[in-house]
């Protein structure tokens, strides 16, 4: 107890009334107004509580403090008076803050700031929406993926910032009268092939596809090594050339270089150059046979294999190339005597005659074309005098029945040396490669060296053997007549032909010899 009569035990936030009583300070309260025991406490009065008499007024918030309270303007409002706090409604000067004016960049890009009481909102521009995680940020609406499907199915939706476009897909174009871009765009497939908008190589044929096109190898062509077929960048080569390569197991530098040249010609070949390429191929062959180099050091059998390979390949190449020629008659001759006569026609019903220096060929046009083949009909004849050297001493194989008859009557017949080649070797071909059994025969008239008296003249063809080589044969060929320097042959198939002179004496009207012819 205090001598002056003031209690010293008053609790916190109270003051003594006298020596035995205390009273809570303003802003605090206790259970009873007068505190008489030290056990009582003074607790802060929350003036801001709902039932309180304190009213801060509109656009403001009441903030309780220890022993007191403050009124402050709500967020988004500010006092006109400038006083941060006040005590009652009469002191309240709170009014709305225009955040949009204060900070024009508040809504960032693509949004417009709209002031509201105590706050603001961002209104997105057309084609934008508020980002859920940041409601103040407008982001582009992707109309193409939003499920709205705003474009026609013939178009391709292209989203761009704040908008979208309906564009024709690659290989499509707007239908007549349609725009290209707005959402009412309607498109149709472009036929690049007929409109000439394609990039197909001349070795291919253009095929239109929906919205695109592809380039396919021409018939008889194949894709170049490593390039797939049916692509926009497909480049093809004539299969004719790719198969005409040096025969296996033959080692000749001269021949290898000849085939290098052939392959070069094949690589550079374009259908429009068929005429030039035919001439280059024949010139190359003519040059090879004019100076065969190490080819003639090969064993005889290998030389025959090479000749067989050259004849077979040449026929294929010429047949393939001549399909790209325009109608008409071609005649080419070369320094070493190689000669080509070739006629190209749309199918006609007549016989055709090709004349050369040393040979004439006659056949029916209707043999030339395979039924159902839309291309032109081709008949060709090549004379290759230079082939004779490579075919020197090539064997003549007679049909078994002829052979048997001859053996019975002429012991040792054809044993005293190989038959002699009297004429140039000629090769005949058609656009139709099925020429093993012609419906009407072909006739050849050969001019040749003089026949030695009492020697037998045979019309022969070169039969390509299974082993890639071959031999002379007479099957399907007959000798119609022979004079000293010319012979007429008739054959029921096409191949390479020649006139041989057999090594034996002819008896007068020998019936066995009639069998041979």
């Amino acid at each position: 107890q205090d001598s002056r009569g003031c209690a010293r035990w008053c609790p916190q936030d109270s003051s003594c009334v006298n020596a035995t009583a205390c009273r809570c300070n303003p802003g605090f309260s206790s259970f009873s107004e007068i505190i008489t025991t030290p056990m009582e406490t003074c607790d802060d009065i929350n003036e801001c509580a709902t039932l309180s008499k304190v009213s801060c007024g509109k656009f403001s918030d009441c903030w309780n403090t220890e022993g007191s309270y403050d009124c402050v303007c709500s967020p988004g409002y500010e006092p006109v008076s400038g006083a941060k706090t006040f005590k009652n409604e009469s002191e309240n000067t709170c009014q709305d803050v225009d955040e949009c004016q204060q900070n024009p960049r508040l809504c960032k890009s693509y949004g417009t700031c709209v002031n509201t009481l105590g706050s603001y909102t961002c209104q997105c521009l057309p084609g934008f929406k508020l980002k859920p995680e940041d409601p103040k940020l407008c982001t582009d609406v992707n109309e193409c993926t939003s499920g709205q499907n705003p474009c026609h199915s013939s178009t391709h939706c292209l989203n761009n910032v704040g908008s979208y476009q309906c564009r024709c897909r690659p290989g499509w174009q707007p239908i007549p009268g349609s725009p290209n871009g707005p959402n009412n765009t309607v498109c149709e497939d472009v036929d690049e092939c007929s409109s000439g908008q394609h990039q197909c190589d001349s070795s291919t044929v253009c095929f239109n596809t929906v919205g695109s096109y592809s380039c396919r190898c021409r018939p008889g062509w194949k894709p170049r090594h490593g390039i797939p077929n049916n692509q926009k960048d497909t480049v093809c080569e004539d299969m004719t050339f790719s198969t005409w390569t040096p025969p296996p197991g033959v080692h000749s530098q001269t021949l290898s270089r000849f085939f290098d040249k052939v392959q070069d010609l094949g690589r550079d070949y374009k259908p429009g150059l068929a005429n030039n390429t035919i001439q280059s191929i024949l010139q190359a062959l003519d040059e090879l046979l004019e100076a065969p180099g190490d080819l003639e050091t090969l064993p005889r059998l290998q030389q025959h294999c090479v000749a067989s390979h050259l004849l077979d390949g040449l026929e294929d190449v010429l047949r393939g190339l001549s399909k790209n020629l325009s109608n008409g008659l071609l005649n080419f001759s070369y320094p070493a005597g190689t000669e080509l006569s070739l006629e190209v026609q749309k199918q006609v019903d007549r016989s055709v005659t090709l004349r050369q220096n040393q040979a004439v060929m006659q056949l029916d046009w209707n043999q030339a074309q395979k039924s159902g083949d839309p291309g032109p009909s081709v008949v060709g004849l090549v004379s290759i005098p230079g082939m004779g050297k490579l075919l020197a001493e090539a064997p003549l194989v007679l049909e078994p029945e002829k052979q048997m008859l001859l053996h019975e009557t002429h012991q040792g017949l054809l044993q005293d040396g190989s038959p002699i080649l009297l004429s140039d070797v000629i090769s005949a071909f058609l656009s139709n490669n099925d020429t093993q059994n012609l419906s009407s025969p072909v006739t050849f008239t050969f001019s040749h060296r003089s026949v030695i008296p009492r020697q037998k003249v045979l019309c022969v063809f070169w039969e390509h053997g299974q082993n890639g080589c071959g031999h002379w044969a007479t099957t399907g060929c007959s000798t119609i007549g022979t004079r000293d320097t010319s012979t007429i042959c008739r054959c029921t198939h096409l191949s390479s032909f020649a006139v041989l002179m057999a090594h034996y004496d002819v008896q007068e009207e020998d019936p066995v010899l009639t069998v041979i012819t």
């Epitope: 001269t254 100076a291 065969p292 005597g337």
Partner: antibody, heavy 118, light 108 residues
């Protein structure tokens, strides 16, 4: 062994003609062509022309068309080049060489030196 | 005519050095139609490299040839004294056949 043996040194007067020979051995003469090449002292090689003995076909450098005539005799395996209307410009070493349309000039003769002088 | 231009006209190298000489054609030549010949003083030319890159029989492996189209080259990886000679390129892609002017290689 392939060999091309050329005729020896030739001396000729201006305006005259000369025939150089090149005898081949060791290979099939008609399987290859014979090329003729000119080389003036201190100068490079100049192709004159080719002859292919099998056919007798000749191919000339336009520059030598009126100067040289190429021939070949299959029976003696010999190629010849005749040079006419000789001038001092024709003084040179002339080589023959074996080749084809497809093969390089793989064997050469030893050369014939031609001197044209009055 | 297809003119062949060789460069340099004369070059000098020390033994062991690598040297390259080039041959440029006025129009494209197939690689199989281009050859190189070596000619030593007072001797006949010898086939040295055929078809652009193949060494003729007896040619040392230090020689090589390369190129395509209108340009090709002859390289010696490590020059030796016996390589002193004039080297000619030659084409027979078409008539007239032509030779380059030659590159004379001198050894220091």
């Amino acid at each position: 062994l392939v060999q091309l043996q050329q005729s020896g040194v030739e001396l000729a007067r201006p305006g005259a003609s000369v025939k150089l020979s090149c005898k081949a051995s060791g290979y099939i003469f008609t399987s290859y062509g014979i090329s003729w090449v000119k080389q003036r002292t201190g100068q490079g090689l100049e192709w004159i022309g080719n002859i292919y003995p099998r056919t007798g076909n000749t191919y000339y450098n336009e520059k030598f068309k009126d100067k040289a005539t190429l021939t070949a005799d299959k029976s003696s395996n010999t190629a010849y080049m005749e040079l006419r209307s000789l001038t001092s410009e024709d003084s040179a070493v002339y080589f023959c060489a074996r080749g084809t349309h497809y093969d390089p000039l793989d064997y050469w003769g030893q050369g014939t030196t031609l001197t044209v002088s009055s | 005519e297809n003119v062949l231009t060789q460069s340099p006209a004369i070059m000098s190298a020390s033994p062991g050095e690598k040297v390259t000489m080039t041959c440029r054609a006025s129009s494209s030549v197939s690689s199989s139609d281009l050859h190189w010949y070596q000619q030593k003083s007072g001797a006949s030319p010898k086939l040295w490299i055929y078809s652009t890159s193949n060494l003729a029989s007896g040619v040392p492996a230090r020689f090589s040839g390369s190129g395509s189209g209108a340009s090709c080259s002859l390289t010696i990886s490590s020059v030796e004294a016996e390589d002193a000679a004039t080297y000619y390129c030659h084409q027979y892609s078409g008539y007239p056949w032509t030779f380059g002017g030659g590159t004379k290689l001198e050894i220091k």
